[in-house]
C-alpha cells in the first residue's frame, strides 16, 4: 500500500476517541510499555507518547478492568461483568473456540479389526448447559490449551455416577510434564479444583467406557469450566442474556429468575407477560401452551379429626400451562372427601386422627397398640403400606435430568393404597424418593454371626406403567456416602415384590429414582407414564415400629423375666422359651430360631460350623461303592485361585476379559475369594477405602481391562459379582437342589474315577437370574497335575457360563484323587530263596489315588525253602 | 396498534368453494390463538374454528367439520379459512378475531352470501 | 356445549337512563382455583364489527367509560350500564370462555325510545 505525503488536508492531532492503548509485548525482565494505536492508521497524527505499563504479572480483581488511560483497576459497570484474570465457559450450545474433542480406540487387535466399529464418531457432545462424554468403550479427550501470563487455576463441576466410565482430569504444562498421577482420577461428583503454572496448560479431561453387559453406561458431564491467571482484562464484558448485574463491579451476572426474561447487558430482568412464561435464565418468553391432563397430578391431604381425607388436585411445578386457552384444561375440583386409609403397621391412630407410633415393647396392625405377651419381642422395623402422608424418615425431590440441579419439587404424591411419581418439570427428570435408616437391630434373640451377613432386609412391592423408555432404579447409600445402583427396571414391569439385603450395619438410605425418558428433550409428553410402590417393609430397624411379636429366649431376673439372645446355633422352643442346640449337621434359620425346625439339614458332603450359621466342606469327602469307601482329602486346594477367561473384545475393539476367584473348602465355611471394583477405589481419597465396591465368596468374576490397554500402572478391574454365597452340597451326581453341573461341557473323564461336584448357589437375584446364580466346580482326579492343579473353563463358554447365570469350572488336581487305601496296590510275595522270603508292595497302575496311606515298606521275613521239609 | 384485516367475501353458490383470509399486523401474531365468528344476518355471534399457535391445534363447530380448515402462516401474519361444499346457511358475515381467551380484537368481517 | 341465554332480546330507553342485561349460563363459569368468572361482554355497534367491553365479568377494558359494570358470579351475570349515551345504542353479547366451544348469548339490542 503507498502512502503519499503533501497531498490533501493536513493530519489533525488525534481526539481520545480516534486510538485506544495497547501493552507491548514483555521484555525479558517483566516489564511493557503502554502504546497508543490508532483505530484507522494514518488518520491523525500526535499520539500521546508510550509511558511505562504495570508489571506483566499485574493483574485486576474480579468485578474490574484495567482502564488503560490512567492504568488503573475501575469497577465494571451495571449490566457487565468481568472475570479478572480469568475465562468462563458456561454455554455448551457448540464446543467453545479453543476446545478440541479427540477420540481413540484403546487397543483394537489386528485379528478383529474387521468387526470394529471406528471411533472417529465418539467425542464429548456440547448440551447446552454441560457438555456429555462419550459412553462407548472409546477414549474421548476434551482438551483445552491456555497460555497464563501468571499462576492461576482451573476450576470446573462435574457429574461422574457411573463407575463402568473412566474418568480422568489432567493438564500438561510447558515442560510436556502431566499433573501427578494419582490425582488425575477424578472422585464422584463434585467440583474439580487443580491449580495451574504460569506459561503453556494443556487441560484434558479424558473418558473411557467399558460396559461389557451391554449397558450402557451414564455419561460423565462437565460445566462452569473457569480458568484463572490468562491475562488482564482492559474491558468488561455485558451481561448475557437471561443474565443480569444490578450492581457495580460484578464477577458475574445472576440468572433472570422464572418468568423473567432479559437482553444482552441488562442491570435487571423483565417480567413475563401474563399469557407467557419462561424458565431460569431466558432471554425471552414463550407463550404458554394450553393446559392439558398431563399439567396436574392428585393427591391426598393428611387426615382431619374426623378421620376423612380429601382428594386434592394441583398443578405441576413450574405451571406454565395455560388453563384459559382454548382446548385447555382446568384444574378438577378438589375437595371430595373419603374415610382414611388405616395407619400403617406398628403405628396407632390419635384422636385428632393422626397415626403415631406404638411404644417399643408393643405391636399394632394399624388401630391399637397391644403389648407384646410374655416370652416374645417386638420384630421391629418399618411397613409402609398406606400412604396417606409421606412417613417422617421418607422425603421426596425432583432431580433435574437436563442440569442435574436439585429442583426443589415433589418427585412422588401419596394416593392411599400407592405412592407415584409426580408430574415432572420435564420428562427427563428424576423423580426421587429416599427412605432413611438410621441403623439396624437384629433381634436380641439372634447372635451376631460374622459369615451369614445378613443384618436386615428391604422388600417392596412396585409397578411401572410406561409408553417409551422409562426407568426405575433403586439404589443403595451407606453412612451418607453416594447411593449406589442395586437394580434397574427398564419400561413397563407388572406389580412384582423385590427384596433386598442388608449386610451392614449403618445409616442406609434407599432410593427409588423413575425417570419417564432418558431423552435429552424438556417438555412433559409422557406425564401419564408412572411407578408406584405399593409397600415397603424394611426388618430389624433401629427405633423401628413392631406389627407382630416373636418368640424369645427367657432368663430370669429380679425383675421377672426378660429376653435374652441364646447362644449361637440355638433356637428357642417357643412353649418354654428355653434355649437348644441345634443337632449335628444342621444350621439355623437367620433370624427366625423358632422351633427345632428353624435348624436345616445341611446338603450332602457339608457339616455345619461351630456356631450353625452355614454349611460347608471341610475339605474330605467320602463317597460310597459297594465294594468300598473312597475318601478324599482336598486341603491342598483349600486357598483361593484365580483363574481369566479368554479375552474377549467389545464392539469397539475394547480388549477385556473375565477373572475368577475361588475358594473350595475349609476355614470354617468362611468366604476367602474377593473381588474388587478398582475404577471405584481409583476415585477414592485416601482413608476411604470402605467406599470401595469389593465382593467376598465363594466364587467371584471381575471384569478387568489389562494395564497395556489403559496405559495405567494396574490393569482396571470392575462390576464385581457373586457367584457363590452359599454350599449347597458335594456329590458326585450330575444334579443338586435344582442346580445342574453338565458333565459335556468338559472333556470326559477318562479314569473311570467319578468327578466330584461342589454345588453352589449366590444370593444375587436379579432380573436376568430370576433364581440368582449358581455355580458348580467340578474336582476331577488327574495324577498328572501336581496340587493345586489346573482350573479350566467349559470350552464352548469360555466365560464360565453359557446362561449369564449358570457358571461351571473343572478343577484337575491329583489332589481330586481319593485317599490311598490298601486297595490302591498289589502285594507281592517272593519264592523263599536261601531261608529268606521277600514281600513288595506296588501301587496298582495306573495310580489313581494320592496321600492317604503310604505303600508300605518290603518285608523280608525268615522262611524254610520246600526242600527243608522234604528232607 | 392491533389490527386485523379480511379479504373479499363475495357471492357464492351452494357446494362450491371459498377462501377468506386476514391480514394481522400490529402484534407478534404467533403469539396468539385466532378464530373465525360468523354472524348470520339479524342473528347472534357464533364461532366457527379455532387454530393454535401453530397447526398443531385446531377445533371446529360441529356443522362445520370436514368442509372448513382454518390454517394459518406465522411468517407473514395471516390466517386463512378455506371453506368447502358451502351450504346456504353458511351465508355469514365472517370475522377473524384474536383469541387469547376471550377474542379481544376483531376484523371489520366479511360478507358470504351462498345462493343459488 | 355451554348455552347462553340473555335476557331481554331488546331494549328500547331514553338517554340518561340506566339499563340491566342479564345473562345466564347453563353451568357455572366460576373457576375456583383462580376465583374468576369466564364471561366477556361485547359491544356491536350498527354496521361494526364486536368491541370487548368487559372480561372475567367484571373487568372493563381500557377505555372503555366507567358507566358500564358488570357483576354476577357463577351461572347469573349482569351488564348495567349507568346514564345511557347515544353512542351506547347497540347490540350486547355475553360470551363464556370457560370452555371450548366458546359460545355467545343470542343478543340484547338497546334502543333509543
Known amino acids: 500500500f503507498q502512502v503519499t505525503l503533501g497531498t490533501g488536508p493536513e493530519l489533525h492531532a488525534c481526539k481520545e476517541s480516534e486510538y485506544h492503548f495497547e501493552y507491548t509485548a514483555c521484555d525479558s525482565t517483566g516489564s511493557r510499555w503502554r502504546v497508543a494505536v490508532p483505530h484507522s492508521p494514518g488518520l491523525c497524527t500526535s499520539l500521546p507518547d508510550p509511558v511505562k505499563g504495570t508489571e506483566c504479572s499485574f493483574s485486576c480483581n474480579a468485578g474490574e478492568f484495567l482502564d488503560m488511560k490512567d492504568q488503573s483497576c475501575k469497577p465494571c459497570a451495571e449490566g457487565r461483568y468481568s472475570l479478572g484474570t480469568g475465562i468462563r465457559f458456561d454455554e455448551w450450545d457448540e464446543l467453545p473456540h479453543g476446545f478440541a474433542s479427540l477420540s481413540a480406540n484403546l487397543e483394537v487387535d489386528d485379528s478383529i479389526s474387521e468387526s470394529t466399529e471406528n471411533c472417529t464418531s465418539s467425542k464429548w457432545v456440547p448440551r447446552g448447559d454441560y457438555i456429555a462424554s462419550n459412553t462407548d468403550e472409546c477414549t474421548a479427550t476434551l482438551m483445552y490449551a491456555v497460555n497464563l501470563k501468571q499462576s492461576g487455576t482451573v476450576n470446573f463441576e462435574y457429574y461422574y455416577p457411573d463407575s463402568s466410565i473412566i474418568f480422568e482430569f489432567f493438564v500438561q504444562n510447558d515442560q510436556c510434564q502431566p499433573s501427578a498421577d494419582d490425582s488425575r482420577w477424578m472422585k464422584t461428583t463434585e467440583k474439580g479444583w487443580v491449580e495451574l503454572n504460569r506459561g503453556n496448560n494443556v487441560l484434558y479431561w479424558r473418558t473411557t467406557a467399558f460396559s461389557v453387559w451391554s449397558k450402557v453406561s451414564k455419561p460423565v458431564l462437565v460445566r462452569n469450566i473457569a480458568i484463572t491467571g490468562v491475562a488482564y482484562t482492559s474491558e468488561c464484558f455485558p451481561c448475557k442474556p437471561g443474565t443480569y448485574a444490578a450492581k457495580q463491579g460484578s464477577p458475574f451476572c445472576k440468572l433472570c429468575p422464572a418468568n423473567y426474561y432479559s437482553n444482552k447487558g441488562e442491570t435487571s430482568c423483565h417480567p413475563c407477560d401474563a399469557d407467557k412464561y419462561s424458565e431460569k435464565g431466558s432471554s425471552t418468553c414463550k407463550v404458554r401452551p394450553a393446559c392439558t391432563d398431563k399439567d396436574y397430578f392428585y393427591t391426598h391431604t393428611a387426615c382431619d379429626a374426623q378421620g376423612e381425607t380429601q382428594l386434592m388436585y394441583k398443578w405441576a411445578i413450574p405451571k406454565i400451562c395455560g388453563e384459559d386457552l382454548e382446548g385447555a384444561v382446568k384444574l378438577p375440583a378438589s375437595g371430595v372427601k373419603t374415610r382414611c386409609p388405616p395407619c400403617n403397621p406398628g403405628f396407632f391412630k390419635t384422636d385428632n386422627s393422626t397415626c403415631e407410633p406404638c411404644p417399643y415393647g408393643s405391636y399394632s396392625n394399624g388401630s391399637d397398640c397391644t403389648h407384646c405377651p410374655a416370652g416374645t419381642e417386638p420384630a421391629v422395623g418399618f411397613e409402609y403400606k398406606w400412604w396417606n402422608t409421606l412417613p417422617s424418615n421418607m422425603e421426596t425431590t425432583v432431580l433435574s435430568g437436563i442440569n442435574f440441579e436439585y429442583k426443589g419439587l415433589t418427585g412422588w404424591e401419596v394416593a392411599g393404597d400407592h405412592i407415584y411419581t409426580a408430574v415432572g418439570a420435564s420428562d427427563n427428570d428424576f423423580m426421587i424418593l429416599t427412605l432413611v435408616v438410621p441403623g439396624f437391630r437384629p433381634p436380641q434373640s439372634v447372635v451376631a454371626d460374622t459369615e451369614n451377613k445378613e443384618v436386615a432386609r428391604i422388600t417392596f412391592v412396585f409397578e411401572t406403567i410406561c409408553s417409551v423408555n422409562c426407568e426405575l432404579y433403586f439404589m443403595v447409600g451407606m453412612n451418607s456416602r453416594t447411593n449406589t445402583p442395586v437394580e434397574t427396571w427398564k419400561g413397563t414391569k407388572g406389580k412384582q415384590s423385590y427384596t433386598y439385603t442388608i449386610e451392614e450395619n449403618a445409616t442406609v438410605s434407599f432410593t427409588w429414582a423413575f425417570q419417564r425418558t432418558t431423552l435429552h428433550e424438556t417438555g412433559r409428553k409422557y406425564t401419564n407414564d408412572v411407578a408406584k410402590i405399593y409397600s415397603i417393609n424394611v426388618t430389624n430397624v433401629m427405633g423401628g415400629v413392631a406389627s407382630y411379636c416373636r418368640p424369645c429366649a427367657l432368663e430370669a431376673s429380679d425383675l421377672g423375666s426378660s429376653c435374652t439372645s441364646c447362644p449361637a446355633g440355638h433356637y428357642i422352643n417357643r412353649d418354654s422359651g428355653t434355649c437348644h442346640l441345634c443337632p449335628s449337621n444342621t444350621i439355623l434359620k437367620a433370624h427366625q430360631p423358632y422351633g427345632a425346625q428353624a435348624c436345616v439339614p445341611c446338603g450332602p458332603g457339608t457339616k455345619n460350623n461351630k456356631i450353625h450359621s452355614l454349611c460347608y466342606n471341610d475339605c474330605t469327602f467320602s463317597r460310597n461303592t459297594p465294594s468300598r469307601i473312597f475318601n478324599y482329602n482336598f486341603s491342598a486346594l483349600a486357598g483361593t485361585v484365580s483363574l481369566a477367561g479368554v479375552p474377549s473384545f467389545t464392539s469397539k475393539g475394547l480388549k477385556y476379559f473375565h477373572h475368577f476367584t475361588l475358594s473350595l473348602c475349609g476355614n470354617q465355611g468362611k468366604k476367602m475369594a474377593v473381588c474388587t471394583d478398582n475404577v471405584t477405589d481409583l476415585r477414592i481419597p485416601d482413608g476411604e477405602a470402605g467406599f470401595s465396591k469389593s465382593v467376598t465368596a465363594y466364587v467371584c468374576q471381575v471384569v478387568i481391562i489389562p494395564s497395556e490397554v489403559m496405559g495405567y500402572k494396574a490393569g482396571v478391574s470392575s462390576q464385581p459379582v457373586s457367584l457363590a454365597d452359599r454350599l449347597v452340597g458335594v456329590s458326585t451326581d450330575m444334579t443338586l437342589e435344582g442346580i445342574v453341573s453338565p458333565v459335556e461341557l468338559f472333556h470326559p473323564e477318562t479314569s473311570g474315577i467319578p468327578d466330584i461336584v461342589f454345588f453352589f448357589r449366590s444370593n444375587d437375584v436379579t432380573q436376568s437370574c430370576s433364581s440368582g446364580r449358581s455355580t458348580t466346580i467340578r474336582l476331577r482326579c488327574n495324577p498328572m497335575k501336581a496340587a493345586p492343579g489346573t482350573l479350566r473353563l467349559p470350552s464352548m463358554c469360555s466365560d464360565g457360563t453359557c446362561d449369564g447365570c449358570n457358571f461351571h469350572f473343572l478343577w484337575e488336581s491329583v489332589a481330586a484323587c481319593p485317599l490311598c487305601s490298601a486297595s490302591d496296590y498289589h502285594t507281592f510275595v517272593s519264592s523263599c530263596v536261601a531261608g529268606i522270603q521277600k514281600t513288595t508292595y506296588m501301587w496298582r497302575e495306573p495310580k489313581l489315588c494320592s496321600g492317604g496311606i503310604s505303600l508300605p515298606e518290603q518285608r523280608v521275613t525268615i522262611c524254610k525253602t520246600i526242600d527243608f521239609w522234604l528232607k | 396498534e392491533v389490527q386485523l384485516v379480511e379479504s373479499d367475501g363475495g357471492f357464492v353458490q351452494p357446494g362450491r368453494s371459498l377462501t377468506l383470509s386476514c391480514a394481522a399486523s400490529?402484534?407478534?401474531?404467533?403469539?396468539?390463538?385466532m378464530s373465525w365468528v360468523r354472524q348470520a344476518p339479524t342473528k347472534g355471534l357464533e364461532w366457527v374454528a379455532t387454530?393454535?399457535?401453530?397447526?398443531?391445534?385446531?377445533n371446529y363447530r360441529d356443522s362445520v367439520k370436514g368442509r372448513f380448515t382454518i390454517s394459518r402462516d406465522n411468517a407473514k401474519s395471516i390466517l386463512s379459512l378455506q371453506m368447502d361444499s358451502l351450504r346456504s346457511e353458511d351465508t355469514a358475515t365472517y370475522y377473524c378475531a384474536r383469541h387469547p381467551s376471550y377474542f379481544d380484537y376483531w376484523g371489520q368481517g366479511v360478507m358470504v352470501t351462498v345462493s343459488s | 356445549d355451554i348455552v347462553m341465554t340473555q335476557s331481554p332480546s331488546s331494549l328500547a330507553v331514553s338517554a340518561g337512563e340506566t339499563v340491566t342485561i342479564n345473562c345466564k349460563s347453563s353451568q357455572s363459569l366460576f373457576y375456583s382455583e383462580n376465583q374468576k368468572n369466564y364471561l366477556a361482554w361485547l359491544q356491536q355497534k350498527p354496521g361494526q364489527s364486536p368491541k370487548l367491553l368487559i372480561t372475567w365479568a367484571s373487568t372493563r377494558q381500557s377505555g372503555v367509560p366507567d358507566r358500564f359494570i358488570g357483576s354476577g358470579s357463577g351461572t347469573d351475570f349482569t351488564l348495567t350500564i349507568s346514564s345511557v349515551q347515544a353512542e351506547d345504542l347497540a347490540i350486547y353479547h355475553c360470551q363464556q370462555y370457560y370452555d371450548t366451544p366458546r359460545t355467545f348469548g343470542g343478543g340484547t339490542q338497546l334502543e333509543l325510545k
Open positions: 400490529g402484534f407478534t401474531f404467533s403469539d396468539y390463538y
Open positions: 387454530i393454535g399457535y401453530d397447526v398443531s391445534y385446531t
